[in-house]
């Protein structure tokens, strides 16, 4: 078929409207002015263009803006955003949170795509840090977003942004990530009273050191077993039986069901059997009476 490049008489588009869905690809290419498309991008989202037609519209914008689209166009891309590649997005300079929200809305309900990941990366790098409003927005669309960041990236999260984090946002975080987030959370919530503080800090405790757990044990917090099981093993090991009992409160009985799992298993091995017996839970595996426990790590440090 001979390539048709001239726009047929009477078909020149005067506005972006639904009549364009009846155009063939070559007619769209020939009859739609790229500058018109750019100024009326907000209309595209309401019109059911086919994927092939969207390819043509994207091509027209690419020709008009070879160095990357301006934010005025990006904000109104609508579902044409789904046609963008990460390479396209790397050319953009997105500074407005409204633009970010508009594009995240397009992808709502789906897994985070490479396009969205690139968009977020560009946005956050442009801002210099993950401020509270951005974090609020991102975790609203992608609850697992925070845990997809490296510890290095998380270090740019200011403590004030921690207020936007919900417990479910941390579900998939590993200990290295919580190690970074916990001190920020501790700082963010430092002026709260005991019980309110514990409610807020609880989700972050997978990054807490021993001394903070000891301090919590003095505050009648009644930590649940699910939270206890997510604590760092190295932070739990030095806790005494009395401290764990105070930390867990009525939930201490749950230790029996978890005695074969870390960190409970490793903690039991470090406790005197006599002390474990005081709990009345039938926990076994502690250090038998009369045995001397040498902390070899201390000995090495002294020599």
């Amino acid at each position: 078929e001979v390539e048709k490049t001239a726009c047929p008489s009477g078909k020149k588009a005067r506005e972006i409207d639904e009549s364009l869905i009846f155009y063939k690809k070559w007619e769209l290419e020939a009859c739609v002015d790229a500058a018109l498309l750019a100024t009326q991008m907000d209309r595209v989202n309401a019109i059911p263009f086919t994927y092939e037609q969207l390819d043509v519209l994207k091509h027209k914008l690419d020709e008009l803006y070879p160095q990357g689209y301006p934010e005025s166009v990006i904000q109104h891309l609508g579902y044409l955003f789904l046609k963008m590649s990460p390479e396209d997005i790397r050319k953009w300079n997105v500074t407005s949170l409204e633009t970010l929200k508009a594009l995240l809305e397009v992808n709502k309900g789906h897994e985070m795509s490479p396009q969205v990941a690139t968009l977020i990366d560009r946005f956050v790098k442009g801002r210099g840090q993950l401020d509270k409003d951005t974090l609020d927005t991102l975790t609203a669309f992608y609850p697992g977003y925070l845990c997809s960041l490296s510890p290095e990236e998380l270090s740019s999260v200011p403590p004030s942004s921690i207020w936007a984090v919900r417990p479910q946002d941390l579900d998939t975080c590993d200990p290295r990530q919580l190690d970074v987030l916990y001190p920020k959370a501790r700082l963010a919530f430092q002026n709260m009273n005991g019980s309110e503080y514990f409610v807020k800090i609880q989700s972050f405790l997978g990054g807490a050191p021993t001394e903070d757990l000891k301090a919590l044990s003095q505050q009648n917090v009644s930590m649940d077993l699910a939270t206890f099981m997510k604590l760092r093993t190295d932070a739990v090991l030095p806790l005494t039986v009395a401290e764990v009992q105070k930390l867990l409160g009525p939930h201490v009985e749950g230790l029996k069901a978890e005695e074969r799992h870390r960190p409970v298993r490793d903690w039991i091995l470090r406790q005197r059997q006599d002390d474990l017996d005081t709990l009345g839970l039938g926990l076994q595996g502690g250090i038998p009476n009369g045995y001397l426990v040498l902390d070899l790590s201390m000995q090495e440090a002294l020599s």
């Epitope: 409207d17 639904e18 869905i21 989202n45 309401a46 019109i47 059911p48 609508g78 579902y79 789904l82 397009v106």
Partner: nanobody, 112 residues
């Protein structure tokens, strides 16, 4: 999210009629253009008819003018396509679309 579910397709003889329905749920449609598309075996998607939900403007492809009628029932959130004087070349999967959202399609076969 918007869901679109088409129904009403089937086997019909040349010259016969069918009425396709598309029930829309999940979001109000005031801001959308709705349309019927079709895809014949081995061919690309082509627009059949459209209706602008807010203005009521109707547009038809040349190949169905005078034979097909697009309409809507706001109270039922339903889009229709009345197809009369059907021809063998109308055989295709017919899809309903609203903005970026598309249905799964319903098969129309015109054959004697």
């Amino acid at each position: 999210q918007v869901q679109l579910v088409e129904s009403g397709g089937g086997l019909v003889q040349p010259g016969g009629s069918l009425r396709l329905s598309c029930v829309v749920s999940g979001r109000t449609l005031e801001s959308y253009v709705m349309a019927w598309f079709r895809q014949a075996p081995g061919k690309g998607l082509e627009a059949v008819a459209s209706i602008n939900w807010s203005s009521g403007r109707l547009i038809y492809a040349d190949f169905v003018k005078g034979r097909f009628t697009i309409s809507r029932d706001n109270s039922k959130n339903t889009l229709y396509l009345q197809m009369n004087s059907l021809r063998p070349e109308d055989t295709a999967v017919y899809y309903c679309a609203a903005g970026r959202y598309w249905g799964q399609g319903t098969q129309v076969t015109v054959s004697s």
